[in-house]
Interface confidence: low
């Protein structure tokens, strides 16, 4: 198989080195020459020629392949020209010859992928590998080949990417800290509890890849899908030269699904305790897990220990399945929070779902705000509300919704960021229900919407009322 990697080498006598401390040369003969017909001789400048012991392999398709593995490491020297020639002993003729530098004929053995697992974000894949010859790993570059594992489509899309060793890991900016300036105050950012943009292809060229030594992280994959992956390496072309080695044996990995699919929502009320909730699946049990990471750059240990998220008592102990599962844990404000939900179906199959990582200050849920109103003229309401949290008044945005009596559809209004009230024009002599909710969406704090306030019933007057 590796021989085919040298196909672009036009020399009849092909040579390669796995570790630059070894050398293998071979050539193919179509003719059925008797055993012992050929000798492979070699010599460094100003040295006597020596014979390299040959073995032959019958190649039914080609004839015979003659192979020489240099017997002694001492005979393999870098940066000196090595003369090689094949002599026909019986005909006393040179069959073929070449001059090479061992340092330019590298064909590294494939790395061994030792671990492949989901990364810290949905659609991320993290792999680590071992280099068969660690002493040359600094002089190699790596390429990763991967694609979706689809039994129905063995020729699914494949991505081949060079691993960028100069990058340590993806910049760990604050997860999802989208600038609040370029959006309406209450626009939904892509938060761990909301639908982000859907990935359309499991192997888009946009997927990012970074590496640190013997590990790398791929992103932009399809959460919940299975992937196969392979690695190969080649000399960097600066210190050492050669060709791409063969691909490692394929490794397959099942990526966790995106917890968005379960409607995962995590929040804190006190910046200490985090509560997570997700939709309970029919005929399935589920369990939440969490871990904290302080990673700014590549952590030494990329394989975290997940801790149990303490399950909350079911709110309805009746027979029907509760709508949500909830769990809670103590958190820290100096770490990124990672959430995993495992759903076990009746046959015992476990499906994992990964939440998008977040900081605790990105998941602050406000208490439900109180709404006060007075009618200043017919159908003209003045609204007021108390900030649920005075400490973050300037980062709090609100949504007001109202509906006419007997109507199903709600009209939603978004007052300006930090507003403490507003006015509302309604039809005179009509009945309405009004509700208010709040959430943090500033540079310091963000979080999910509070629950809607209890409906406030308003009956507008016929004429001006003070």
């Amino acid at each position: 198989q590796d021989v085919s990697l040298l196909a672009s080498d036009s020399e009849p006598l092909k040579c390669f080195s796995r570790t630059f401390e070894d050398l293998t040369c071979f050539w193919d003969e179509e003719e059925a020459a008797p055993s012992g017909t050929y000798q492979l001789l070699y010599a460094y400048p100003r040295e006597k020629p020596r014979a390299c012991p040959l073995s032959s392999q019958s190649m039914p398709h080609f004839g015979t392949r003659y192979v020489c593995q240099f017997p002694d490491q001492e005979e393999v020297r870098l940066f000196f020209p090595l003369h090689l020639w094949v002599k026909n002993v019986f005909l006393n003729q040179t069959r073929t010859q070449r001059v090479l530098f061992v340092d330019s004929v590298g064909l590294p053995a494939p790395p061994s992928i030792i671990k492949a697992m989901g990364g810290s974000q949905p659609g991320e894949l993290q792999i680590s590998w071992e280099e068969p010859a660690p002493e040359i790993s600094d002089f190699l570059r790596y390429e990763l080949r991967y694609g979706p594992r689809d039994p129905k489509n063995s020729t699914g899309p494949t991505v081949i990417q060079l691993i960028a060793t100069e990058t340590c890991c993806p910049a760990l900016q604050r997860p999802h800290s989208a600038s609040a300036l370029d959006q309406s105050p209450c626009a939904q950012p892509t938060m761990p509890w909301q639908d982000g943009p859907k990935q359309t292809s499991p192997s888009r060229e946009a997927s990012a890849l970074t590496a640190e030594g013997g590990s790398c992280l791929i992103s932009g994959l399809q959460p919940g899908n299975s992937y196969w992956l392979q690695l190969r390496s080649e000399p960097d072309g600066i210190s050492l030269g050669g060709s791409w080695g063969s691909w490692s044996l394929p490794v397959t990995v099942d990526l966790p699904g995106d917890a968005v699919a379960l409607g995962l929502q995590c929040f804190t009320l006190d910046l200490k305790n985090v509560t997570c909730q997700w939709q309970q699946q029919d005929h399935a049990s589920s369990q939440g897990f969490f871990y904290h990471s302080r990673a700014r750059c590549c952590p030494r240990d990329r394989y975290p220990i997940w801790e149990n998220c303490e399950e909350e008592e079911k709110t309805n102990p009746g027979l029907q399945t509760p709508q949500f599962s909830r769990c809670h844990f103590k958190s820290r404000n100096d770490s990124i929070i990672h959430i995993l939900v495992e759903v076990t179906t009746a046959p015992g199959t476990v499906h994992s779902y990964l939440g998008s990582p977040f900081w605790i200050h990105q998941a602050v849920r406000l208490p439900t705000p109180n709404l006060h109103w007075r009618e200043i003229s017919s159908g003209h309401l003045e609204l007021e509300w108390q900030h649920p949290s005075s400490w973050a008044a300037q980062e709090t945005c609100y949504q007001l919704r109202y509906t006419g009596e007997g109507h199903q559809d709600w009209k939603v209004l978004e007052p300006p960021l930090g507003a403490r009230g507003g006015t509302l024009e309604l039809r005179p002599r009509s009945r309405y229900r009004l509700q208010l909710r709040a959430r943090l969406n500033g540079p310091t704090y963000q979080g999910p919407w509070s629950s809607w306030s209890d409906p406030t019933r308003v009956e507008t007057a016929t004429e001006t009322a003070w």
Epitope: A32, S35, S56, S58, P60, H61, G63, T64
Partner: antibody, heavy 118, light 107 residues
């Protein structure tokens, strides 16, 4: 035109050694190519037994390796098969075939039936 | 060993029919696949090599397709002399292995 002809005893007793020869005409077996033995139990599919190359290198099916020997008699231009310790499961039609340039069996003998029975 | 699985194991067809036989390898064999035809009491005859290449002298109604693990032999218009058993064989990895055969019978 290359022709292959298998020959050997049609009946072999259990535990004995089955010996077959394949006589090749129209081509020297030491010039080139690889010479194969394949068998087909009654009503069953084909099973590759092994080959010998023009240069005498052999390769055998691991399932039979401990019992099989393929050799050539260059003077008679024959390839021989020896299968030791036979049982009724070795009852089959035995074919020799040439593995040609394309790695496929391009020339076959007509086959010889061997029954293992006491 | 690489397992070769043919389907169907038998089929009934009429003269002029288009017949398709599939062969699946238990691992990737690239295009190292041959198809043989065998008639009762006769030795197999090579039809297709390298998955898609027609052996010299074989009628053009026979064609092969596929690569990797899934392969197909197609007879575009079945002739009376085509009623036989067909075998696929991989020659990617020793030991060479055959499919269990597909018997094409007259309907």
């Amino acid at each position: 035109q290359v022709q292959l002809q298998e020959s050997g005893p049609g009946l072999v007793k259990p535990s004995q050694t089955l010996s077959l020869t394949c006589t090749v005409s129209g081509y020297s077996i030491t010039s080139d190519y690889t010479w194969n033995w394949i068998r087909q139990p009654p009503g069953n599919g084909l099973e590759w037994i092994g080959y010998i190359t023009y240069s005498g290198s052999t390769s055998y099916n691991p399932s039979l390796k401990s019992r099989v020997l393929i050799s050539v008699d260059t003077s008679k231009n024959q390839v021989s098969l020896k299968l030791s310790s036979v049982t009724a499961a070795d009852t089959a039609v035995y074919y020799c075939a040439r593995l040609g340039r394309r790695y496929t069996m391009d020339y076959w003998g007509q086959g010889t039936t061997v029954t293992v029975s006491s | 060993d690489i397992q070769m699985t043919q389907s169907p194991s038998s089929l009934s067809a009429s003269v002029g029919d288009r017949v398709t036989i599939t062969c699946m390898a238990s691992e990737d064999i690239y295009i190292r696949l041959a198809w043989y035809q065998q008639k009762p009491g006769k030795a197999p005859k090579l039809l297709i090599y390298a998955a898609t290449s027609l052996e010299t002298g074989v009628p053009s109604r026979f064609s092969g397709s596929g690569s990797g693990t899934d392969f197909t032999l197609t007879i575009s218009s079945l002739q009376p002399e085509d009623f036989a058993t067909y075998y696929c064989q991989q020659y990617w990895s020793s030991p060479w292995t055959f499919g269990q055969g597909t018997k094409v019978e007259i309907k």
